[in-house]
Interface confidence: medium
């Protein structure tokens, strides 16, 4: 149960040994008690003891003091357990009876006679303190105390709050006097089941299974897991996400070890945009107004900024746009309204409040809706939270990212290493690149996965100039020259400054 009503009988006085009907007990009144506890009644009536009932064995004859007894027959205080929320009010009927029969089980004896009874009605808060009382009638007097306490693991003003302290997989907490959880040091969360990681441990890139720990997810390093691991062999580059090799300005190639000026050689930026030799691909396009896209190749719709309010529909015009307003709204952007609350302008359960003596209105929106008429569902994807081309999906009150193959994490920020599956045969070296793994093959092997044994070694003839390193298996011609600083060209034959007439990879 959730609590216990306790009644302590202290003293019963019946000096003349009389029954309620005026007769006397022979040889004396062998007294036991019947207790009935029920819901509050302004006038106590017969009927079931809705909160419980209990009987005592014979406790004495005529007048006697009742001693405390913790176990067995004749336990005092008497216990009336209940398993509901204590309402704070009650009715109590205490009857004293005489039995000629069995001391231990007087209830079962025939010929029992009522000596006296008392009825108490009132309010009683849960608490440790006993309330003491004494009731007299013409023949008898009863002294007693009572209280309501919560059972073990129950708390609160009405013993309705269950809390059992624990320190295991499901939670690490103790219970407060009001039944709320008090987390043990190092734990947090509603149920104190989340460890508090090492102070400063990166929220996404680190985690812990016990307090003061910081375990890095793949691709991250450092005491606080806030440093990404660049891809192996990255020389003049950095990473902002794991396994990346974002080249410093003026550097290119797989390992950012080739000096190049991408903007001049490739002119990637369209529609009059400005190209600068920076960014993860070696260049960045700064678009003129009205254009967007990685290469400024996309013309922007004039309606892209959603200029029409209050559900107006936008139509592109040659150098502008036109808002077609719904009934009740007007103005260039449908920003003005003739509506009042009488027109029910608030959608999705929004509440309408009149303003300016009822000549205008304002909508108070429920959670998950916004806009002047509560017409827009709150879109948690507008901030583009998903990295690496992940697709954002609104799911009720939250959002999730659906990651592209090769990426994982809450925001698709973690790169799943393609090299973890060891795709390169014959001792080839694996490199994680954006479009999948690339194998650098040892002499005598070629193919995407170094699976082809070649009869002649394309590097054997020494095709690379100026001290360049030769690799096989990376291109149709079966060799690639990795140029030293200051040289470019398919065989590293050109000093920087003399533009080659063909690409660098043979």
């Amino acid at each position: 149960g959730s609590g216990i009503f306790q009644l302590r009988l202290q003293e019963f006085v019946n000096q003349r040994g009389m029954l309620a009907n005026g007769q006397s007990c022979e040889p004396g009144c062998r007294t036991f008690f019947r207790i009935c506890l029920k819901h509050f009644q302004a006038t106590f009536s017969e009927g079931p003891c809705t909160f419980g009932n209990v009987s005592t064995p014979v406790l004495g004859t005529n007048s006697f003091v009742v001693r405390d007894k913790n176990s067995g027959s004749g336990r005092n205080p008497l216990q009336l357990p209940f398993n509901f929320t204590w309402p704070g009010t009650f009715s109590l009927n205490i009857q004293a009876w005489h039995t000629p029969g069995d001391d231990l089980r007087p209830e079962t004896s025939p010929g029992n006679s009522l000596i006296s009874q008392i009825i108490i009605q009132g309010s009683l808060a849960v608490g440790k303190i006993w309330r003491t009382d004494e009731q007299n009638d013409t023949l008898t007097r009863l002294s007693y105390s009572y209280r309501v306490i919560c059972s073990d693991n129950y708390y609160g003003e009405s013993c309705s709050r269950l809390c059992k302290k624990r320190d295991d997989h499901f939670g690490h907490y103790e219970c407060q006097p009001d039944g709320s959880l008090s987390c043990l040091p190092g734990w947090t969360g509603k149920y104190c089941d989340q460890p508090i990681c090492l102070s400063g441990c990166h929220e996404q890139n680190g985690y812990c299974s016990k307090p003061d720990e910081c375990i890095c997810r793949p691709g991250w390093q450092g005491r606080l897991c806030n440093e990404c691991i660049p891809h192996n062999g990255c020389r003049h580059g950095t990473c902002s996400i794991p396994w990346q090799c974002a080249c410093d300005e003026g550097w290119g190639g797989l390992f950012c070890d080739q000096d190049l000026n991408y903007c001049t050689h490739h002119s990637p930026c369209k529609n009059g945009s400005t190209c600068s030799n920076s960014g993860p691909k070696g260049y960045t396009c700064t678009c003129l107004p009205g254009y967007t896209g990685e290469h400024c190749e996309l013309g922007l719709s004039k309606c892209a900024s959603n200029p029409c309010r209050n559900g107006g529909s936008c139509k592109d015009q040659e150098n502008s746009y036109h808002c077609l307003c719904p009934p009740g709204y007007y103005g260039q952007h449908c920003e003005h309204s003739t509506l009042t609350c009488a027109d029910s302008p608030c959608f999705n359960g929004g509440s309408c409040r009149e303003r300016n003596q009822g000549s205008s209105y304002a909508c108070e929106c429920p959670p998950n809706f916004t806009g002047s008429n509560c017409e827009k569902k709150v879109d948690r994807c507008t901030s583009n939270p998903c990295a690496n081309g992940g697709q954002c999906q609104n799911r009720g009150p939250s959002r999730t990212c659906r990651c592209r193959p090769g990426f994982t994490g809450t925001h698709c920020e973690l790169h799943i290493s393609d090299c973890a599956r060891s795709p390169c045969a014959h001792g080839g070296t694996c490199h994680d690149l954006e479009n999948g793994p690339v194998c650098t093959c040892p002499a005598g092997f070629s193919g995407r996965r170094c699976e082809v044994r070649i009869t002649h070694d394309a590097c054997a003839s020494g095709p690379c100039f100026n001290g360049a390193t030769c690799y096989t298996g990376l291109s149709p011609n079966n060799f690639v020259c990795n140029c030293p600083y200051g040289f470019v060209g398919s065989r590293c034959e050109f000093p920087v400054g003399l533009p080659p007439s063909f690409p660098w990879v043979a």
Epitope: G311, P326, P327, G328, T338, L339, T340, A342, D343, S344, F347, N348, N373, E375
Partner: nanobody, 116 residues
Amino acid sequence: EVQLVESGGGLVQAGGSLRLSCAAAGSTFSSYVMGWYRQAPGKQRELVAHISTRGITYYADSVKGRFTISRDNAKNTMYLQMNSLKPEDTAVYYCNTRRNFLSNYWGQGTQVTVSS
């Protein structure tokens, strides 16, 4: 579902008058904000006038003082009285109502032609 049916269009000389009607069926008409729109050939559809449930009206600048919008809730009908018509008023006239941002109801339209 709300059905809207326009009537009253036709051919009229410049300076003449026409009265368009829009009959609504299928729901409590009195609780709807109603509007008249028009679309001339090769042009965007535009708002002409609208009337709220309490009879508060709005008119586009181009028709102010010439057109009058009204409604008869007992007959579930909205009207557009068009006076001093001009050739530039030639268009297909549509009536529209909207119960929420997803339920936007249009009539099939009625042709108004003003000859000079």
